[in-house]
């Protein structure tokens, strides 16, 4: 594949990454799959600067990111190390709350109305953000 040099239509470029902001809601797994089908991944927040950029674009709306602990440890979908990486949880979060009555705890992370993170039930239909890196090889064949 060829190296992607500019963002697809309707995607926003920022710091050598492209971002797509949904305007509808999906469960976390469906949002994750949507991004993968776009040769991207749910957004991985690696810095305060990136946090502010995403926050500016999503506004005060619950929005999924690419962070979950469905199999135990917290993991970013692109393999970025959670332990040493950037974190922006709300106070008292994550709490893996079981009191919602939906079964299980809270295994998927989202931006809250103030931008800070919360863990929530992965089935909730929140908006989402896809991200892809400009420097990574595209799956599309090169133009001849």
């Amino acid at each position: 594949g060829s190296e992607r040099t500019c963002c697809p239509v309707n995607w926003v470029e920022h710091e050598r990454s492209c971002y797509w902001f949904s305007r509808s809601g999906k469960a976390w797994a469906d949002a994750d799959n949507y991004c993968r089908l776009e040769d991207a991944h749910l957004v991985v927040v690696t810095s305060w600067e990136e946090q502010k950029f995403v926050q500016h674009h999503i506004g005060p709306v619950n929005t999924w990111m690419g962070l979950h602990d469905q199999n135990g440890p917290w993991k970013w979908v692109d393999g970025t190390d959670y332990e040493t990486g950037f974190k922006n949880w709300r106070p008292e979060q994550p709490d893996d709350w079981y009191g919602h009555g939906l079964g299980g705890g809270e295994d998927c992370a989202h931006f809250t109305d103030d931008g800070r993170w919360n863990d929530d039930v992965c089935q909730r239909p929140y908006r989402w953000v896809c991200e892809t890196e400009l420097d990574k090889a595209s799956q599309e064949p090169p133009l001849l």
């Epitope: 199999n71 440890p73 994550p94 893996d96 009191g99 299980g104």
Partner: antibody
């Protein structure tokens, strides 16, 4: 590397108290629910208690409710289990474990309640 | 509270055998089920979470299936190191509860 090390077990008389500790390392402690699970001699596993990452939510098995208190000190990366009014049936190896799916366990500490 | 039952309580098998252990919940727990392996004198080891998701480092001869109330742990080809006691656990709601265990020993 994730490590969980329990301590504080020992022999105690019925009605007595004991405080177990679990020192955690190798991960972002405050991001995880922590649990205590016990296993009586020759018995199966019994979930005892859990606490949210920040410590604001606690959960207990009916068998220990009102007698045991789970807590944590995130500044010290340590989980605690205060056990009061101990009974013979509380005799067990007590394990500390990370998360609902128990992806990491300590090696356990033995609590013996006997006169 | 949700009660968990396991069958059989024990079984004898040989290396290379296919082994199936079943776990049943007293109410619907979706896929909030984990499986553990424990050897004498050792802490339990997590094998599977979310009913069928194999934990990192667990051999592929282990598999889990099921949803709702009925679940299965399958060992496709029993290895010498697989002789142990196996427990299921629901984490649908507190208090979490374990099954009574299934001991797999040498035939």
């Amino acid at each position: 590397e994730v490590q969980l090390l329990e301590s504080g077990g020992g022999l105690v008389q019925p009605g007595g108290s004991l405080r177990l500790s679990c020192a955690a390392s190798g991960f972002s402690f405050s991001s995880y629910v922590m649990s205590w699970v016990r296993q009586g001699p020759g018995k199966g596993l019994e979930w005892v208690s859990a606490i949210s990452g920040s410590g604001d939510r606690t959960y207990y098995a009916d068998s220990v409710k009102g007698r045991f208190t789970i807590s944590r000190d995130n500044s010290k990366n340590t989980l605690y289990l205060q056990m009061n009014s101990l009974r013979a049936e509380d005799t067990a190896v007590y394990y500390c474990a990370r998360t609902a799916t128990k992806d990491y366990w300590g090696q356990g500490t033995l609590v013996t309640v006997s006169s | 509270d949700i009660q968990m039952t396991q069958s059989p309580s024990s079984l004898s098998a040989s290396v290379g055998d296919r082994v199936t252990i079943t776990c049943r919940a007293s109410q619907v727990i979706s896929n909030y089920l984990a499986w553990f392996q424990q050897k004498p004198g050792k802490a339990p080891k997590s094998l599977i979470s979310a009913a069928s998701s194999l934990r990192s480092g667990v051999p592929s001869n282990f598999s889990g299936s099921g949803s709702g109330t009925d679940f299965t742990l399958t060992i496709s080809s029993l290895q010498p190191e697989d002789f142990a006691t196996y427990y299921c656990q629901q984490y649908h709601s507190y208090p979490f509860t374990f099954g009574p265990g299934t001991k797999v020993d040498f035939k």
